[in-house]
């Protein structure tokens, strides 16, 4: 058993049918010695008397808010949560496996640049009685500071019969140098509590591996005289790290017909312009990627050919 | 990704082309190592990230773009002193810091070159003959060093008398390639920046 926060305790259980569970001793936080009784949650049934209460915690029915009283007055509370270990592996019931970029990905994180600011998000089908708390650091043995905000509900989607809820959090490394070569990964730890179930999820990454630039901005077309060709031009996104000559991007320009089946013409360039043939009803899209370290491509910025 | 390769203009900063080749070569070598050594811990998540140049050179600090010198987090250790002649320097534009930067890059390349050559000698003794260093990568390191053209004592190749542990050598190769790729990215950024200025 360990303390998650004041008066909230997590009991770790080897979870299998008929498991013996864990013996837990609760102590009433009071100078009083006599006449103390214990109850669980809203029940008035007295579970025991005395300054300490010994319980065998086996299932969720044994978890909850234990309260000690004296003469009708509440002296203190202890909330017991359960953390299930199923065959040596901590349970992951609360969050959905996003399966991207690989199986068992519960937390996904992205950064728009090298400033040390990043966003993580996760999915769940649970709508109520759910709380998250997020901590982060650079490295784990001698951790350096990363400050995270509160996790907020950022999107709701309908997936088949189920509703899916996306939560996200923003974090900022306290003293980040955009040019630094990372040797210690960022660690992100999310505590999730649903009713009386506790779970924790972690992700470890280098900022360089989670970079996803914003799409190029000011995408414009300039028709070339007496030609079906157009000059496409764009700019680096505002959120990208500066100077751009150091933090350079490379670009992919795509001409896409109205039908998804039509052949896509693609050009790669390090410049912020390109000459392409504009077909009728087609659209021109441009996306960006770090020129030197191949992390994710940005989303497409698009303009119609007409 | 399959990008068209840009050929540098004759007037272009001479080292940019070499640094681009270096990044391409080390990235290819790392990819090859990951595939060949699939049963070894060779992915970024599995290896310890060690920097053999740590406390010996300070390329990131010495080569910091001017715009980032205002960022205190980037200025933790800028006490470097290196030799200051080199043919990549377009002489009149050369600042003292630029010379320090390029000589620091040269020292990095020299240290990695020695490590890679020592390691290759060990890998050639492996009865499995599983993986060797790409000669192209070694050549590209050499070309960039020549382009930088700094006078510096030659570092003798390390020779080891004891029987090599091939498992450890292959893991060390992965660690080295990951670190060298990161340094090659920095070198490419620096050359691109210097070329633009």
């Amino acid at each position: 058993i360990w303390e998650l926060k004041k008066d909230v305790y997590v009991v770790e259980l080897d979870w299998y049918p008929d498991a013996p569970g864990e013996m837990v001793v609760l102590t009433c936080d009071t100078p009083e010695e006599d006449g103390i009784t214990w109850t669980l949650d809203q029940s008035s049934e007295v579970l025991g008397s005395g300054k300490t209460l010994t319980i065998q915690v086996k299932e969720f029915g044994d978890a909850g808010q234990y309260t000690c009283h004296k003469g009708g007055e509440v002296l203190s509370h202890s909330l017991l949560l359960l953390h299930k270990k199923e065959d040596g592996i901590w349970s992951t019931d609360i969050l959905k496996d996003q399966k991207e970029p690989k199986n068992k990905t519960f937390l996904r994180c992205e950064a728009k640049n090298y400033s040390g600011r990043f966003t993580c998000w996760w999915l769940t089908t649970i709508s109520t009685d759910l709380t998250f708390s997020v901590k982060s650091s650079r490295g784990s043995s001698d951790p350096q500071g990363v400050t995270c905000g509160a996790a907020t509900l950022s999107a709701e989607r309908v997936r088949g019969d189920n509703k899916e809820y996306e939560y996200s959090v923003e974090c900022q490394e306290d003293s980040a140098c955009p040019a630094a070569e990372e040797s210690l990964p960022i660690e992100v730890m999310v505590d999730a509590v649903h009713k009386l179930k506790y779970e924790n999820y972690t992700s470890s990454f280098f900022i360089r591996d989670i970079i996803k630039p914003d799409p190029p901005k000011n995408l414009q077309l300039k028709p070339l005289k007496n030609s079906r060709q157009v000059e496409v031009s764009w700019e680096y996104p505002d959120t990208w790290s500066t100077p751009h000559s150091y933090f350079s991007l490379t670009f992919c320009v795509q001409v896409q017909g109205k039908s998804k089946r039509e052949k896509k013409d693609r050009v790669f360039t390090d410049k912020t312009s390109a000459t392409v043939i504009c077909r009728k009803n087609a659209s021109i899209s441009v996306r960006a990627q770090d020129r030197y370290y191949s992390s994710s491509w940005s989303e497409w910025a698009s303009v119609p050919c007409s | 990704r399959n990008l068209p390769v840009a050929t540098p203009d004759p007037g272009m900063f001479p080292c940019l082309h070499h640094s681009q080749n270096l990044l391409r070569a080390v990235s290819n070598m790392l990819q090859k190592a990951r595939q060949t050594l699939e049963f070894y811990p060779c992915t970024s998540e599995e290896i310890d990230h060690e920097d053999i140049t740590k406390d010996k050179t300070s390329t990131v600090e010495a080569c910091l773009p001017l715009e980032l010198t205002k960022n205190e987090s980037c200025l933790n250790s800028r006490e470097t002193s290196f030799i200051t002649n080199g043919s990549c320097l377009a002489s009149r534009k050369t600042s003292f810091m630029m010379a320090l930067c390029l000589s620091s890059i040269y020292e990095d390349l020299k240290m990695y070159q020695v490590e890679f050559k020592t390691m290759n000698a060990k890998l050639l003794m492996d009865p499995k003959r599983q993986i060797f260093l790409d000669q192209n990568m070694l050549a590209v390191i050499d070309e960039l060093m020549q382009a930088l053209n700094f006078n510096s004592e030659t570092v003798p190749q390390k020779s080891s008398l004891e029987e090599p542990d091939f498992y450890k050598t292959k893991i060390k190769l992965c660690i080295l390639l990951h670190a060298f790729r990161i340094r090659a990215v920095t070198i490419d950024r620096v050359m691109s920046y210097l070329n633009a200025s």
Epitope: W15, P17, D87 | -
Partner: antibody, heavy 115, light 112 residues
Framework: QVQLVQSGGGVVQPGRSLRLSCAAS????????MHWVRQAPGKGLEWVAF????????YYADSVKGRFTISRDNSKNTLYLQMKSLRAEDTAVYYC????????WGQGTMVTVSS | SYVLTQPPSVSGTPGQRVTISCSGG????????VKWYQQLPGTAPKLLIY???QRPSGVPDRFSGSKSGTSASLAITGVQAEDEADYYC????????????FGTGTKVTVLG
Amino acid sequence: QVQLVQSGGGVVQPGRSLRLSCAASGFTFSSYGMHWVRQAPGKGLEWVAFIRYDGSNKYYADSVKGRFTISRDNSKNTLYLQMKSLRAEDTAVYYCKTHGSHDNWGQGTMVTVSS
Amino acid sequence: SYVLTQPPSVSGTPGQRVTISCSGGRSNIGSNTVKWYQQLPGTAPKLLIYFNDQRPSGVPDRFSGSKSGTSASLAITGVQAEDEADYYCQSYDRGTHPALLFGTGTKVTVLG
């Protein structure tokens, strides 16, 4: 004590369907994940499928994906394996089993796919 | 489809020490715990070892398990006639959990 009693096995022709059941008693069935495991005659153990305690997630072996469906009725304390488009290579003893460090197995039920 | 490899058979005379190996990789045994099962003819498998080296109550102490790196082993010290059975190791793969990975199985024969 924990008990898992299986039923539903038998002889079936290729391409036909069969549903296996596993009735649980002696524990809070709705709190635990459950597996199906099979063993072809003279062969080793092969995992078939898993279902979470609340039925929210299901996982299948590639060899049965799209043909077999694992399900549970927590109000009846019963686990099911619906098998469709059966093939000769599905011939095996099928076991249900609880998920956890200490597990409990059903007695097994024989499924024979033969024309 | 088996990624945990066991020897097909091992044998010993009563009282001898018999060991069965189970060889896997970094993503399974290297990152997860190992179980061992005993299966007597015509019966369901019985758990012998969990968490690599723990014995459930009721399992004789002549059975012991160990794990090192990407391999595990089961030892029977002082093998007895009633130990003649098939033995399977089981683990998980970190990418496909909760799918159970079973070893290929080992037939233990007690001679004489």
